[in-house]
């Protein structure tokens, strides 16, 4: 029998190198039953996640799972940071892992990075 | 169940580069985190570096000072190593390794490959 | 890195005793998700690695209930209440909390 929890589906430490400037789409997959759960994104402040108000958010309906998507548009140097989405269901707060955003500044980067040196070395990115 | 099978040569020459592939069956590869780890004969483990398949994100330990590379075929639903200038030091069992992303609910090795280096 | 010291180094059991294994991390393995990602492996002669123990009191499907983990912060204990003779391995933890992940360098549970 298959649970009928919510379920957000962000792996732990997961990351993405993004561009300033350029558009980018953060997703949040929700696995939920019969009612989908009211769901919102927070960029975090030290230990705290600060619940990000008035930006455009949108739903994604596929097969077997729903995305919750925080659009960045286009993206800033200051959007580098870890988000988490979290979902209201039945009264309890279901929070996903938090996935960060690595964002390389093209102003300040002599050449745009390929994806691979990107992805394999995040620490010389923008932070 | 999910498995994980290591394929590749068991000899490498010094200077050369040592290619690994592991192919998982019973989960698909993008839920998971897929890792490399390595065993000396007779001694610990040392963990290599691992990737997101969903996206090709992925991480390393310094301490293999970019030699090694890690990539990852959905389509396949496999991943692949490949450790470059390699010495007698790196010979090793190479083990791949996958576990869920999400709620790290399993956590399962393939049954490793003697790599030994030597002309 | 983060460093695992594990102890002792060959721990030497008959069957049917208690086996206590210490693990102690050089840095608090508490993540910012509040959990604490403290495995612990066996291995026996020949075969590939096994996790018994996540988030340092998990047990994985089908490990016995005569293995627990315990814990927090830089201390960790694995104990088999009672040890069988299929139990004669090495055991090692690990951590998952940070990059670069790193294990202990293991304990031997040998036949006393």
């Known amino acids: 029998k298959e649970s009928c929890d919510v379920q957000l589906y962000i792996k732990r430490q997961s990351y993405h190198s993004i561009f300033a400037g350029d558009p980018f789409k953060l997703e949040c997959p929700v696995k939920y039953c019969a009612h989908r759960p009211q769901v919102t994104w927070c960029k975090l402040n030290g230990t705290t996640c600060v619940k990000l108000e008035g930006r455009h958010t949108s739903w994604k309906q596929e097969k077997n799972l729903s995305f919750f998507i925080l659009h960045f548009e286009p993206v800033l140097p200051s959007d580098n940071g870890s988000y988490r989405c979290s979902a209201n269901f039945l009264s309890a707060i279901i929070e996903s892992h938090s996935t960060t955003l690595y964002v390389t500044d093209v102003k300040s980067a002599s050449e745009r990075p390929s994806k691979d040196e990107m992805a394999s070395r995040p620490w010389l990115l923008y932070s | 169940q999910v498995q994980l099978q290591e394929s590749g040569p068991g000899l490498v020459k010094p200077s050369g580069t040592l290619s690994l592939t592991c192919a998982a069956s019973?989960?698909?590869?993008?839920?998971?985190?897929m890792y490399w780890v390595r065993q000396p004969p007779g001694k610990g483990l040392e963990w290599i570096g691992r990737?997101?398949?969903?996206?090709?994100?992925?991480r390393y330990n310094p301490s293999f000072k970019s030699r090694a590379t890690i990539s990852a075929d959905k389509s396949k639903n496999q991943a692949s190593l490949k450790l470059s200038s390699v010495t007698a030091a790196d010979t090793a069992v190479y083990y791949c390794?996958?576990?869920?992303?999400?709620?790290?609910?399993?956590?399962?090795w393939g049954q490793g490959t003697l790599v030994t280096v030597s002309s | 890195e983060i460093v695992l010291t594990q102890s002792p180094g060959t721990l030497s059991v008959s069957p049917g005793e208690r086996a206590t294994i210490s693990c102690r991390s050089s840095?608090?393995?508490?993540?910012?998700?509040?959990?604490?990602?403290l495995n612990w492996l066996q291995q026996k002669p020949g075969q590939a690695p096994r996790r018994l123990i996540y988030?340092?009191?998990k047990r994985d499907t089908g490990v016995p209930d005569r293995f627990s983990g315990s814990g927090s912060g830089t201390d960790f204990t694995l104990t088999i209440s009672r040890v069988e003779p299929e139990d004669f391995a090495v055991y090692y933890c690990?951590?998952?909390?940070?990059?670069?992940?790193?294990f202990g360098q293991g304990t031997k549970l040998e036949i006393k």
């Open positions: 988030l340092v009191s």
């Open positions: 390794a996958v576990y869920d992303g999400y709620y790290e609910s399993f956590d399962v």
């Open positions: 690990w951590q998952g909390t940070l990059f670069p992940r790193t």
């Open positions: 019973g989960v698909n590869i993008k839920d998971t985190y």
């Open positions: 990737i997101d398949p969903a996206n090709g994100y992925t």
């Open positions: 840095q608090s393995l508490l993540d910012s998700d509040g959990k604490t990602y």
